[in-house]
């Protein structure tokens, strides 16, 4: 089970002093920002028990493995469900604490009820302040049952839940009708997924026999030990005031664990610390009782005395839970409750025993989970004990489980079970990622998802040029940092692989899949300069540039021209893919725009230094075309043109330009300016008689605008040849009057 404890400080005289602390004993717990462990989360869960909104609670992190919730301003802030989430991946675990108001109408006799599948659970709500109305029971916030107030037995309302199943788990409450929900008695029911003493997917496996009130986890068969006890079977008491799976945590304050409720992963639930009992965990155990909630009885024999924290303290010459074992009986000494080895290793396991008669090498044996018995290969005999050493054959995954060291002499026998975890060395599932590259170095992220078991202790990066038979270069790196491979060859492909290791002998995993990473080519060093440019239209610009002359071949693949439109905050890039090019035509630019222009040489993906910038102003585009152009012959040498002004003008028209061309003629057209822009009519004179002409016109503001539609008209016939067309302009009405 995950080593996660939620502590509630129940000294309730002042809610502002109340706090909840979540402590994780997991390696790397709560580091959050790195890839190895999500942070501890501690929060109030308002989904079932809703309380009036108050100021937000304050969350304080104390190092990587502890988080504390404070800021409770009134007693009602405390009522309800709190949860702490810790552990990574599949081991992510939620620990739940249910807080009842000490002033509620109904109070739970016992808040947490852990029962086995198929059992009958009985929840008991004690009357604290009587009301003569129905009592409503709810399950996870939904109506469940009603009791008449007359149905109280001994001042308690009982809810019997026969044949409970795992879905029955959750938060139960008992409330008087019309009473505030805050006056309810809140309970937590935990239903193990198996019957008593069983665990596993089909509940086929037998629990190890958890001692001192430990509860067998229905998924993994491990004992979840009460606070203050440790060991595979919770057989060992911690020193007073200590808790955690290895007794590594210490209760805060001078009064030790007094006034603290401890909540552990399901199926344990919550209890007082060892040596304490009562609704607020402030009462010491009565004589003869010990452990969490003082639920255990000492029953010491042979002159043993009862310690409320650890149970029987035996006089010399005796040992055992009740001091029932004579020291003459052999005894296994100081056996670790849990050992961890890597797959396919051949570890040595030591088992020490004492007794009278003295144990010898052949009297100590090691039994694997599959029943195989190993005999020790050597023994170290000391005055007070014999230590047998066992050479374990190559470990396989099936060796995970409970092993047993057994000693047998004529004085009797003793055995000690301990858990062996066979861990699979980590193997990367993916290749490392290339972050950035230069001509002589690659920056690589070595951290990838992996199969097998963590934690990752070291990361090795192996690399060598592609298709090379030379030895691999290896760099050992910190798991959480990116790696820079240096002193590489430019424009070269490298094969790069990751190898992960976990702690312990044989913890190195197989190499991960290779990936090809290629260094960049050399950076281009030459700086071009702009020779000149000229505008070829309102949206076209021709640019030319030069490069300094240097000996040797040119390092570059082409040029990049950059135009920056500062007004709009837009950049236009034009790629010239020949290193020999020294000119380029830029089209599709925005008329009337002020551009900053520069050019730089590129090689592969690398850019050389940019030329000093030039500033270019494109002329603005002209106005829209004049509308409804019409031609009307007046004589054998005159044609009158009429039109309407363009719409949506960006400014005042400076002039109109008329284009005149003989229809079907091969010569250049003639352009005639109409310098009075307010006119909407003009007469073109000096035309040839009986000749078909094409006309179109455009307006000019700062630049020339779009051409109008083209119109055709023929002069009248008299056979005379004119000198050439000229124009006369007047108001349209005047022309019509004539």
């Amino acid at each position: 089970a995950v080593d996660l404890t939620l502590l509630a400080n129940l000294r309730l005289t002042d809610p502002q002093r109340f706090f909840l602390t979540c402590v994780s004993g997991e390696a790397g717990a709560g580091r959050g920002s790195d890839a190895w462990g999500p942070p501890l989360l501690l929060e109030k869960d308002d989904r079932i028990v809703r309380t009036p909104p108050g100021p937000p609670l304050r969350l304080a992190r104390n190092g990587s493995h502890q988080v504390t919730l404070r800021g409770f301003s009134k007693p009602s802030d405390l009522v309800g469900v709190f949860s702490c989430v810790g552990g990574a991946g599949a081991r992510r675990t939620r620990v739940i604490y249910v807080h009842n108001s000490p002033g509620a109408h109904l109070l739970p006799d016992k808040v947490t009820h852990t029962v086995n599948k198929g059992d009958t659970a009985v929840l008991s709500a004690r009357v604290h302040k009587e009301k003569q109305t129905d009592v409503i029971w709810k399950s996870n916030g939904s109506y469940f049952y009603t009791l008449d107030w007359h149905e109280a037995q001994d001042g308690r309302f009982l809810l019997q839940l026969p044949n409970v199943q795992p879905p029955s788990s959750g938060i139960y409450s008992a409330t008087y009708l019309e009473a505030s929900p805050l006056g309810s008695a809140f309970f937590r029911l935990i239903v193990r997924g198996c019957g008593a003493g069983r665990w596993g997917p089909g509940c086929t496996k037998e629990c190890p026999g958890c001692l001192h009130g430990g509860v067998c986890h229905d998924h993994d068969g491990e004992c979840v030990c009460p606070p203050g006890f440790t060991g595979t079977r919770c057989e060992q008491a911690c020193r007073e005031g200590r808790f955690g799976q290895s007794c590594q945590e210490q209760c805060p304050g001078i009064s030790g664990c007094r006034g603290l409720t401890f909540c552990l992963p399901d199926p344990y639930g919550c209890s007082c610390g060892s040596g304490w009992r009562g609704s607020q965990c402030q009462e010491a155990c009565a004589p003869g009782h010990f452990g969490a909630d003082c639920r255990l009885q000492c029953q010491c024999q042979n002159g043993g005395t009862c310690d409320r924290f650890s149970g029987c303290v035996c006089p010399s010459g005796w040992h055992g839970v009740h001091c029932e074992k004579s020291d003459r009986i052999p005894q296994i000494l100081n056996m670790a409750s849990e050992l961890e080895f890597n797959l396919e290793t051949m570890p040595r396991i030591n088992c020490a025993a004492a007794g009278n008669p003295f144990p010898v090498r052949g009297s100590i044996e090691l039994r694997k989970p599959d029943g195989t018995v190993l005999l020790s290969t050597k023994a170290i005999v000391e005055p007070e004990k014999t230590t047998a050493e066992f050479e374990v054959p190559r470990l396989v995954l099936a060796d995970s489980g409970f092993w047993e060291c057994r000693v047998s002499t004529s004085g009797g026998q003793d055995s000690r079970r301990f858990k062996v975890n066979v861990k699979v060395p980590p193997v990367p599932l993916a290749a490392p990622r290339l972050l950035t590259k230069q001509s002589r170095q690659l920056v690589v992220s070595p951290l990838v998802s992996f199969s097998g078991d963590g934690p990752i202790s070291t990361v090795r990066l192996h690399y060598r040029p592609q298709d090379s038979t030379m030895d691999w270069s290896t760099i050992v790196v910190d798991p959480s940092e990116n790696v820079t491979l240096m002193n590489l060859r430019p424009k070269t492909g490298y094969s790069v692989r990751v190898q992960l290791s976990r702690p312990g002998e044989g913890g190195e995993g197989a190499w991960g899949p290779p990936t090809l990473m290629t260094t960049d080519c050399p950076e281009p060093l030459l700086q071009p300069w702009l020779e000149g440019w000229h505008v070829e239209g309102t949206d076209r610009l021709r640019v030319s540039w030069s490069l300094p002359l240097v000996p040797g071949p040119l390092v570059g693949d082409g040029f990049l021209l950059r135009l920056w439109d500062g007004t709009r905050g837009q950049e236009r890039r034009e790629n010239v893919s020949s290193p020999q090019a020294r000119t380029a035509l830029l089209t599709g630019l925005t008329p009337g725009t002020h551009y900053q222009l520069d050019v730089q040489l590129y090689h592969c993906t690398l850019l050389g230094p940019a030329s000093p910038p030039a500033h270019v102003l494109l002329p603005p585009s002209g106005p829209p075309a004049p509308r409804h152009l019409h031609a009307q012959a007046l004589s054998d040498s005159e044609i009158q043109l009429t039109w309407k002004h363009p719409e949506a003008l960006p400014g005042p028209i400076s002039k109109y330009v008329v284009e005149v061309q003989v229809a079907g003629g091969a010569g250049d057209p003639l352009w005639i300016d109409v310098d009075r822009p307010e006119e909407t009519s003009t007469i073109i004179r000096g035309l040839n008689a009986s000749t078909r002409y094409l006309f179109r016109m455009r307006a000019s503001i700062q630049g020339l605008g779009d051409w109008s539609n083209t119109v055709e008209e023929s002069t009248l016939g008299n056979g005379l040849q004119a000198e050439g067309p000229v124009q006369e302009s007047r108001a349209a009405e005047e022309g019509l009057d004539q």
Partner: antibody, heavy 119, light 109 residues
Framework: EVQLLESGGGLVQPGGSLRLSCAAS????????MIWVRQAPGKGLEWVSG????????GYADSVKGRFTISRDNSKNTLYLQMNSLRAEDTATYYC????????????WGQGTLVTVSS | QSELTQPRSVSGSLGQSVTISCTGT?????????VSWYQQYPGRAPKLIIH???RRPSGVSDRFSGSKSGNTASLTISGLQAEDEADYYC?????????FGSGTQVTVL
């Protein structure tokens, strides 16, 4: 869907007995209070009797106390009303209704069964 | 256990509002906020239209509204429609079980 179906009504002579049943479905019968309500022809509704989920607590209107007995069989999802010493004024349509639990109101009703006490 | 007092009948024109009162004692209406109202058509079972004094079950028109003051609860039907013509009963929790009103016939003119 919650359904309540009454049965057992009919014609009975004064002083006689009758047992009404109410078959419940569509909800967890063993969790809810149940009640009987009656309505004499052309008259209003009158609460007759009620029983808590466990069957351990019951209540009766003064007009039927000592003559009527309410009971339930949670294994059969059925509510009963045993009516003894019937009188002409017990003539009515008898409805079985479910108490809403945390909604404190008879929320679902059966269609009723008619009991006629007449000689 | 005496029944709650309601007017024998009330009437109103189409589109008008009518209010039905329901008077109890300090042991029922005055003590608990568990007053409900039922609509009953002839020959049919009662249908719940208001519970907990003011709350409407889903599917019940928002033209029906409930209120309570002291020992008296009220049901208001606004925008009276032809289908509202029925008998209406109030009901109050009275500790353990219930007491019903005498019933009010609503006529739509």
């Amino acid at each position: 869907e919650v359904q309540l179906l009454e049965s057992g009504g009919g014609l009975v002579q004064p002083g006689g007995s009758l047992r009404l049943s109410c078959a419940a479905s569509g909800f967890t019968f063993s969790s809810y209070k149940m009640i009987w309500v009656r309505q004499a022809p052309g008259k209003g509704l009158e609460w007759v009797s009620g029983i808590y989920p466990s069957g351990g607590a019951t209540g009766y209107a003064d007009s039927v106390k000592g003559r009527f007995t309410i009971s339930r069989d949670n294994s059969k999802n059925t509510l009963y009303l045993q009516m003894n010493s019937l009188r002409a004024e017990d003539t009515a349509t008898y409805y079985c209704a479910r108490d809403g639990g945390d909604i404190v109101v008879p929320d679902y009703w059966g269609q009723g069964t008619l009991v006629t006490v007449s000689s | 256990q005496s029944e709650l007092t309601q007017p024998r009948s009330v009437s109103g024109s189409l589109g008008q509002s009518v209010t039905i009162s329901c008077t109890g004692t300090t042991s029922d209406v005055g003590r608990y906020n568990f007053v409900s109202w039922y609509q009953q058509y002839p020959g049919r079972a009662p249908k719940l239209i208001i519970h907990d004094v003011t709350r409407r079950p889903s599917g019940v028109s928002d033209r029906f509204s409930g209120s309570k003051s002291g020992n008296t609860a009220s049901l208001t039907i606004s925008g009276l429609q032809a289908e509202d013509e029925a008998d209406y009963y109030c009901c109050s929790y009275a500790g353990s079980f219930y007491v019903f009103g005498s019933g009010t016939q609503v006529t739509v003119l």
